[in-house]
Structures are given as C-alpha cells and as structure tokens.
C-alpha cells in the first residue's frame, strides 16, 4: 500500500479555492523527489496539472501552485477560481505519475445556492451554536417577532416571541429581544444538527409593513483533520469543543463500516479492549479541552476518529464534535522493539525503549500505565534517577545502548509487576511506546544469596551463579544507587577447560569487598550483557555490621541465604594482585565451580520464539 496520504474527498463551490495537503514519509529521497498533482482520465492515465519542478498546465495557469514542505514530509496544492469542470478524480504523488507512490483524491465542485438578495450566510459546524441577527424598524418594535424555516414553497414557524417553539428545536433555541433603542432581535440555536441546514426567514410585525430578513444556515460536518503517523509510534488527538460543554462527559470514538461510531475511550470509564495498555485520556483543561494519546500504533488503528461531548459519553446528534482521519505509515522510522517482555518471579527483565535518535540529550522516562478511570502513568524512573522509593534496589534506567534506544532493568520481579509500561522522553511525543511485562512460570537463571551481612573491616565475597547458556556473555557486578548502577571493576581470569566444556560445569562470578566499609552497605546487582545489550540481573542487599570476630570470610549459609542448590565454597578467599583496579577494595572475580546443572530448567519459556514482538528476560 502506498505510504502517500491525503484527503479522499474535497468539496467546494464554484469560484472558491481549495488547498489540498498530501503527506509522505520524509526520507531523504522522498524529500527531494518530484511531487505532482494529476488528473485521471478515462484511459486510466494521469495527466500532470502541476508539479514541484515548476510545471503548470495551461488549464491551471495563474490559478494553481504546488509547494513542498520537506521538513514536514508534506506538500500542498492550491487551486483557485474553481469551476464545475474541475470536478473529477485526481492523484497527489511522488516520482513519476504511474509509479504508485500516490493517493487518490476526489474533487467535487458544486454550484453555489441561488439565494434571495440581502441573504446573510451563516456557516457553522454541527453541534455548535449560531446566533441569527434580525433587524426591524421602530414601528415593529412592539409587534410579534418570529423565525421561520423555508421548506420548499412553505414556511414553517420555528420560534416566536409569544413563546412558541417548534418541537424539532425544543430545549436548544431561544429568541432574545433587546432593550429599548436596539432595533435587532436575535435567535440563538444551540447543538446544531445537519437537519437544521437551510434557508430561514426573520420576521417582525405583520402585513405589508412587516420587516423580513433572509438567513442561509449552512451546517457542516467538521472537516476531518488529516493525521499521518508512523507504525509503532504514538498519536495525540487534541479535542477542543468549547466552554459550553466543559462540564459534559467527553469521548473519542472510531467510525466503523456501518457509519456508527464505536467508543474508544470516554471520561465515564469506558475503554475499548483493543487499546488496553496503550491509551490515555488527559483530563480536560479549564476551557474544556482534553487530549487522547494512543501508542504502539497498528495498521488496523487507521480510520476516522471523532471526539465529542455528551452526558452518555458517546456520539449523539447535535452535540459538538471534532474529526480526524488517521493514516498509519508502514515505512516507519520507529524501530521494532518487543511489545511483550516475559520474566519469572524473582527474576528480571531488560526492556528496550526507542527514542528519536536526534534527541540523545532528552530526558528519558519510564512509567506504569494505570487503566483505572481515564488512565494515568505515574513516573517510576527517569534518566536523572529513580523516582518511586518502593522500587529501590530493583529498578534502573540506562542510556545504553544509545543512538535511539535506552534500557530499563527491573528485577526481583513479582506477579504485581505484570502490566503495561510506557517509554517516554521530554522530546518527540510520537516516539512514545508501550511494553507489557508478563510474569511466567520458571526459575531465575542467576542465583545470588537472599541477603548478606558484612562485617566492617573484613573481606566479603558474594557468589553469583550463572548457567552455561550465559558462558559467552559478559558478566558484571554493579552497586545500585538511585541514579544508576555503577559497574565494579572486574578481573577476567580468561578461558579455562570448564569454560570450554560448559555443559559439565556451572559458573560463578564473585564480588569481593576488601575491606568492608560503611559505604559498602546497599544493593548490588549481578548481571549478564552482550556489548551494550543487557540481559538478566539478580539483586542482593548487603548490610554492614560492627566487627565481632577477626579474620576474612566468604559468605556462608550462616550469614547469607544461599541460593537454591548452591554449593557452599570453602571459606578461604584467594588473593588477587590489585593490578589496574581503580578502587583496590572492589573487584569481581570469576570462579569455576562444580556443575549444579543448568538451573534455568523452568525458565526456558522466558524467550518465546512464537512472536517476533516478544522478548524474554534476557536480551539477544
């Protein structure tokens, strides 16, 4: 399907002008290639009428132009002095006319209505309010004032100053007669309907001396605003319906094939399940305006959307609406990233979040989508640091791998962590994305002690077991803080027989603190990664207490909760020379220990190859 998008139907009146905007993916090639507007003939060929290279057909000379806006990925065709002959089928497109990078546009030019002389024209959108002004002479001031609607050759009374109101206008019309000296009365009609369209007659007095004024009321369906967004990206519908409906329930709905409108979300708490986890309704401002954000755009999200106000929270005739036509461009600049990430209870997930690579300095945010009411997304962590204290020691946002992607790591998972999370920045809002975390059956792959008590001044070793499948990954220990996880210097012992024959051996990476200080208290993470892509992590809290007995010690079951099936190592700690270690108290060492089996038996499901849109707890 062509990625070019524009208005399907354009209508106007003879003598008027139209402006047609067409959208295209703003790639370098597209920005500089030829843009055209052509008319489809009976033969199927499309004859160029105007192009970005300066060509204008004789039929369009002096009344049309085409302007390219490469920075927006749009071009605009303006046509003036329209005639009935301009009605027809057109294409706006890129490149050569026959190539298919185009969008079909139907233009209909109709004859303007023949109106009596002196007719005042009122053009108003459906659902809005019109005020019809009716002048009269002084002698008709005390006489009856009335508004009639002309239907064919007859006139039907709509309202008069004797308190008559036509049932079709009940509760939405009023006639105002000003104080003395003002020779004009007004009729105000609220919540205009399409059926209100037509010619009206104001009348004051009767007989030959009466005052009359014609008014042509044109009630329009709102012209849908074209919205062009990238697949997997985000769209914001900003809905401003006016103060008159500030206190009325609001909704966003999508027009279906039956031309009715299905509620997507409303302020009464209704939400379409197809948008679960990826839609938020921002509460209204004082002026009654509100906005709806949808992330993770799919091709099937395309269509016509209406926002409106009504006490039922759904579309009703005669209430104000705003319209959009959404096109989802499949030639997306937003990279594919997993929409579902799976982790096991006690384990971890590493979530990749895309952002606009042109905005590397932007603040990065990660929030938890809450569906209650209209939805909120409380901030959990950002690039400046942790925000929610209840995630202390188990949540971190990393700028890596960079160049359009950041990483969020959440460990010590529980079933409560299942849900939808949003990746945001303070920059380009179209790059907001949603990820769902699912907690599945299984065991964490990395095993660390449950908690550790270290003795001031002594040596502390904390083991972290990893299965063979991580033997090729980089292992690390880091100290968690609310601004990140500072990697501790590590010493690589190099390959060994056990490394090569990993199927027979489990492996261990140890953190050594020597000597333990008060500042060492806190959370430590053991993790695996491949380059800048993070995999699983496991967290352990180290408490520091006063020295009771002398001597160095290894973490043993007496002072630490051993990981399941963990073999306890002898208490001797091998000395390693402090060569090229920034902080001589901190280093991580890898030890090979006897195989305890691949303890990831139950967690193989954390990588589900059934969907390219899913990732497990470990990055590939």
């Amino acid at each position: 399907k062509s990625p070019v998008f524009g208005p399907q139907e354009v209508s106007s009146v003879e003598g008027n002008s139209v402006s047609i905007k067409c959208y295209y993916p703003p790639t370098s090639v597209n920005r500089h290639t030829r843009k055209y507007w052509c008319r489809k003939g009976a033969s199927g060929r499309c004859i160029t009428l105007v192009s970005s290279e300066g060509y204008v057909s004789s039929n369009y000379a002096g009344r049309a132009n085409l302007t390219n806006f490469p920075e927006n990925g749009t071009f605009v065709v303006n046509i003036a002095q329209l005639s009935r002959d301009d009605s027809g089928h057109y294409k706006c497109g890129l490149g050569i006319n026959s190539r298919g990078l185009s969008f079909d546009v139907s233009l209909e030019v109709s004859q303007g209505p023949e109106l009596p002389n002196g007719t005042e024209v009122y053009t108003v959108d459906v659902g809005r309010t019109v005020t019809i002004k009716c002048p009269f002479k002084t002698e008709n001031a005390p006489k009856t004032k009335a508004l009639y609607k002309k239907i064919g050759q007859t006139s039907v009374l709509v309202i008069d100053s004797r308190n008559y109101v036509n049932p079709n206008y009940k509760d939405r019309i009023r006639l105002r007669i000003p104080g003395t000296g003002q020779l004009i009365f007004t009729v105000v009609i609220d919540r205009l309907r399409l059926s209100d369209h037509g010619l009206y007659l104001c009348q004051a007095g009767d007989g030959s001396n009466r005052d009359e004024k014609n008014a042509d009321l044109q009630v329009l369906e709102p012209e849908p605003e074209l919205v062009y967004e990238d697949l997997r990206g985000s769209v914001t519908f900003h809905c401003a319906l006016g103060l008159e409906v500030a206190n009325v329930a609001k909704f966003l709905c999508r027009v279906n094939s039956r031309e009715t409108c299905d509620v997507v979300i409303n302020t009464l708490g209704k939400r379409d399940s197809a948008f679960e986890g990826r839609i938020l309704l921002n509460p209204q401002d004082k002026d009654g305006s509100f906005s709806v954000v949808i992330t993770g755009l799919r091709k099937e999200d395309e269509g016509r959307y209406l926002c409106g106000a009504h006490s039922d929270g759904q579309l009703q005739e005669g209430w104000p609406i705003q319209a959009w036509q959404l096109f989802v461009n499949e030639e997306s600049t937003i990279p594919r990233s997993p929409t579902v990430v799976k982790g096991v209870a006690g384990g971890s997930v590493a979530v990749l979040c895309p952002y606009n690579p042109k905005e590397s300095q932007s603040l990065k945010y990660w929030c938890l989508w809450e569906g209650a009411q209209n939805g909120r997304c409380p901030l959990l962590v950002e690039s400046q640091g942790l925000v929610q204290e209840q995630y202390e020691g188990r949540l971190s946002l990393l700028q890596e791998p960079g160049n359009g992607t950041f990483t969020v790591i959440l460990n010590q998972l529980t079933t409560q962590d299942a849900g939808f999370y949003w990746c945001l920045t303070n920059g380009d809002t179209r790059w907001r994305t949603t990820v769902e975390i699912k907690i599945i059956e299984g065991e964490p792959n990395l095993k660390v002690p449950g908690n550790v008590t270290a003795v001031l001044g002594e040596t502390l070793n904390i083991p972290c077991h990893f299965p063979c499948k991580f033997s090729s990954y980089e292992k690390y220990w880091c100290k968690w803080s609310n601004t990140g996880c500072q990697t501790l210097p590590s010493q690589d012992e190099g390959p060994s027989e056990a490394f090569v024959n990993c199927d027979e051996n489990s492996r261990l990476v140890s953190l050594t603190l020597n000597p333990v200080t008060r500042a060492d208290e806190g959370w430590y993470w053991c993790g695996v990664k491949q380059g800048h892509f993070y995999g699983e992590t496991a967290a352990v809290y180290v408490a520091v207490e006063e020295k009771k007995v002398a001597g160095s010690r290894y973490v043993s079951p007496a002072k630490a909760d051993a990981a399941p099936d963990e073999k306890v190592l002898d208490s001797g700690v091998r000395e390693i020379e402090n060569k090229a270690i920034q902080d001589p108290r901190l280093f991580a060492e890898e030890k090979v220990v006897a195989d305890t089996g691949d303890q990831a038996g139950g967690s193989r499901a954390s990588v589900d190859s059934s969907s390219s849109e899913e990732q497990g707890g470990s990055s590939k």
């Epitope: 938020l280 921002n282 509460p283 640091g385 925000v387 945001l424």
Partner: nanobody, 131 residues
Framework: QVQLVESGGGLVQAGDSLRLSCAAS????????MGWFRQAPGQEREFVAA????????YYADSVKGRFTISRDNAKNTVYLQMNSLEPGDTANYYC????????????????????????WGQGTQVTVSS
C-alpha cells in the same frame, strides 16, 4: 500532602551571603523537584532555582547563575539555597515549592522552571538586600 517551611531570610548588605532552608514533611516519598521562587512587591513570582529530588540535577534562572547554589539533603528532607554576592535586585519574598512525580501525560511536559508545575508551596521568607 507535603508541608514546606522556609527559614534563613533576613536583612543583609549588598555583596553578602545568605543561606535559605526549606524543610519538607508529610509524604516526602512523592517528591520529584524542589524549587525556589521569589516575588518582589508588585512583581510576578519568578523562578530562581530547582533541584531534582532523586538525581540531584540542578536548574537556575540566568539572573542567579554563578551566585546561587541549590542543594538537598534527602536524609533530612531539606533543600537549601546558598545565595552569594547578593544584590539589591535580589530583595524579595522567597518561596520554597515542591512538585510530585508526573502522573498525567501533560505533567511530563512541564519544566522545573514553570510555576504551574509545582503542587506544594511554603509561606515564604523575606530577603532584603540593602545597598
């Protein structure tokens, strides 16, 4: 709710220093930004400085950059404004303000310099700089 109490204001000479404190109590776990604003008689309230409660990133108005320093002590739930090289133009009522972490998408757009971004305010402390 978060309650804020400012202290440290007073009358000083131009060129002198002053340190303002703002003690937060209540639901301090929800704090996101803490800021200082000032309002001179007949003037609009204006941004002075702000600090990110978790990460410690700081923001300053151009008029005070290099002279004022904002800092925090999370353990004491207190934010400080160290004001050096004071000028008569710094005379104003100084207000401490606190902002909750964003929850609604519109909250994410608000900058630490915007008055509308803050949810809680102190009563203010008067700083007078005489020439």
């Amino acid at each position: 709710q978060v309650q804020l109490v400012e202290s440290g204001g007073g009358l000083v000479q131009a060129g002198d220093s002053l340190r303002l404190s703002c003690a937060a109590s209540g639901r301090t776990s929800s704090l996101y930004n803490m800021g200082w604003f000032r309002q001179a008689p007949g003037q609009e309230r204006e941004f002075v400085a702000a600090i990110h409660w978790g990460g410690g990133r700081t923001y300053y108005a151009d008029s005070v950059k290099g002279r004022f320093t904002i800092s925090r002590d999370n353990a004491k739930n207190t934010v400080y404004l160290q004001m050096n090289s004071l000028e008569p133009g710094d005379t104003a009522n100084y207000y401490c303000a606190a902002r909750r972490a964003p929850e609604l998408l519109d909250d994410y757009k608000q900058k630490p310099e915007e008055i509308g971004a803050y949810h809680y305010w102190g009563q203010g402390t008067q700083v007078t700089v005489s020439s």
